[in-house]
Interface confidence: low
C-alpha cells in the first residue's frame, strides 16, 4: 500500500493543534492498519534450511505488550538429507520496531518511545573464513 | 488495554491500562542504533536465499528510511553456486510500528502505524501438492 503524503511544518498555528508540553509529543496509540495480517508462506520457520523457534516476550509496561522473538534452532543449516551441515551457518535476521515504554517514578507515570531490535527469523549463509597466517 | 501492577501506595485514580493517547518524551531510547542493514551485515549476499535491499523513503514517517528485502531468486543457491529450483527462496515478513504525523501539519502530534516489511529471505523446502 502506498501511503499518501501529508504536508508537514513545525510552525503551524497552535490553535489548530493539540497543546503539548515542551519536550514531549502527543502520541495516539490506536494503531493505523491494526488489523493488517502477515501473509507469510506457511510454516516457513520449520521448513527453512535454517529453522527457528518463536518466543513471546511479555511486558505489561510496554505497548504493544507482546513482542515475538525468533531463535535459530541450529548453528549449522539443514541439508537435503535432513541433517545439520556445520559447514554452513544459521544466522538471525533482525529488524527494528518502535514500542512505547511506561515508566513509574514514584506515583507518577511517564511514557517513552523506544527502538527495539526484533529477531524475525533465520537464514542460511556461507561462513566467513578467516585464514590464520 | 494492558493491565499493569500498581504501586499500592499510589492514589487509585491511576489508569491500569495504556490510555489511547499518551504524552511521550521526545527523546527516543536506543534511537541511534544502526538502521542500515547493508552496513550491519552482509547476510543478504552470503545467504543461500540472497536478497536485494530497496530503500523505502517517506519523509512523513519516522523512521523515514526503511529497507525492504526482495529475494533475488525463486530457488536457492546450492553448494556449486547455482540456483536449485527444488528449494524456494521466500521473504521473511515482519509487522513493525512507525510514527505518522496526525493530524497533518501539527508539529508534536503523532499516531502509531503498523506496516509490513520484508526483512530478508530464507530457503525452504517447497510444499508439494500431489494431484490425484
Amino acid at each position: 500500500r502506498k501511503i499518501p503524503k501529508v504536508g508537514h511544518t513545525f510552525f503551524q498555528k497552535p490553535e489548530s493543534c493539540p497543546p503539548v508540553p515542551g519536550g514531549s509529543m502527543k502520541l495516539d496509540i490506536g494503531i493505523i492498519n491494526e488489523n493488517q495480517r502477515v501473509s507469510m508462506s506457511r510454516n516457513i520457520e520449520s521448513r527453512s534450511t535454517s529453522p527457528w523457534n518463536y518466543t513471546v516476550t511479555w511486558d505489561p509496561n510496554r505497548y504493544p505488550s507482546e513482542v515475538v522473538q525468533a531463535q535459530c534452532r541450529n548453528l549449522g543449516c539443514i541439508n537435503a538429507q535432513g541433517k545439520e551441515d556445520i559447514s554452513m551457518n544459521s544466522v538471525p535476521i533482525q529488524q527494528e520496531t518502535l514500542v512505547v515504554r511506561r515508566k513509574h517514578q514514584g506515583c507518577s507515570v511517564s511514557f517513552q518511545l523506544e527502538k527495539v531490535l526484533v529477531t524475525v527469523g533465520c537464514t542460511c549463509v556461507t561462513p566467513v573464513i578467516h585464514h590464520v597466517q | 488495554g494492558i493491565t499493569i501492577p500498581r504501586n499500592p501506595g499510589c492514589p487509585n485514580s491511576e489508569d491500569k491500562n495504556f490510555p489511547r493517547t499518551v504524552m511521550v518524551n521526545l527523546n527516543i531510547h536506543n534511537r541511534n542504533t544502526n538502521t542500515n542493514p547493508k552496513r550491519s551485515s552482509d547476510y543478504y549476499n552470503r545467504s543461500t536465499s540472497p536478497w536485494n535491499l530497496h530503500r523505502n523513503e517517506d519523509p512523513e514517517r519516522y523512521p523515514s528510511v526503511i529497507w525492504e528485502a526482495k529475494c533475488r531468486h525463486l530457488g536457492c543457491i546450492n553448494a556449486d553456486g547455482n540456483v536449485d529450483y527444488h528449494m524456494n527462496s521466500v521473504p521473511i515478513q515482519q509487522e513493525i510500528l512507525v510514527l505518522r504525523r496526525e493530524p497533518p501539519h501539527c508539529p508534536n502530534s503523532f499516531r502509531l502505524e503498523k506496516i509490513l516489511v520484508s526483512v530478508g529471505c530464507t530457503c525452504v523446502t517447497p510444499i508439494v501438492h500431489h494431484v490425484a
Epitope: F10 | L26, Y62, P63, L99
Partner: nanobody, 119 residues
Framework: EVQLVESGGGLVQPGGSLRLSCATS????????MYWVRQAPGKGLEWVAE????????YYVDSVKGRFTISRDNAKNSLYLQMNSLRAEDTAVYYC????????????WGQGTLVTVSS
C-alpha cells in the same frame, strides 16, 4: 553517507548581513523539509526557520521574521539562510538539519557555523 556542511559564519557588526550555506549529500534532498536551528552560548537549541520540500512554504520563528530568509536550491542540494539586520542576540552556532519527522530530533546535523554579532 548523509552529510551536511555549513559555511558562511563569521564576525559581523550589529545591523550587518551574512549568508549561510549548507551543502548536503547522501539523501534525496528534494524530498525533505530542511531547517536552520541555532544554539546561543549557554542556551538551548532554538528553531530558526523551515522550508518545505519544494521551497513553496517557509516558516520563521517570530524573533527573525522580516530579517532572515531561508531558501534552497534542489538542483545543487543546498540550503541557505540570508541574515539581515543582525542583532547581538543572533549570536549563536547555526546548524542546518535534515527534516526528520520528529520535531527537535534529527538523524543528521551539520557541524555548525558560528555567527558572532558584536561591535
Amino acid at each position: 553517507e548523509v552529510q551536511l556542511v555549513e559555511s558562511g559564519g563569521g564576525l559581523v557588526q550589529p545591523g550587518g548581513s551574512l549568508r549561510l550555506s549548507c551543502a548536503t549529500s547522501g539523501f534525496t534532498f528534494s524530498s525533505y523539509g530542511m531547517y536552520w536551528v541555532r544554539q546561543a552560548p549557554g542556551k538551548g537549541l532554538e528553531w530558526v526557520a523551515e522550508i518545505k520540500q519544494d521551497g513553496s512554504e517557509k516558516y520563521y520563528v517570530d524573533s527573525v521574521k522580516g530579517r532572515f530568509t531561508i531558501s534552497r536550491d534542489n538542483a545543487k542540494n543546498s540550503l541557505y539562510l540570508q541574515m539581515n539586520s543582525l542583532r547581538a542576540e543572533d549570536t549563536a552556532v547555526y546548524y542546518c538539519a535534515k527534516g526528520e519527522i520528529l520535531p527537535l530530533y534529527f538523524d543528521y546535523w551539520g557541524q555548525g557555523t558560528l555567527v558572532t554579532v558584536s561591535s
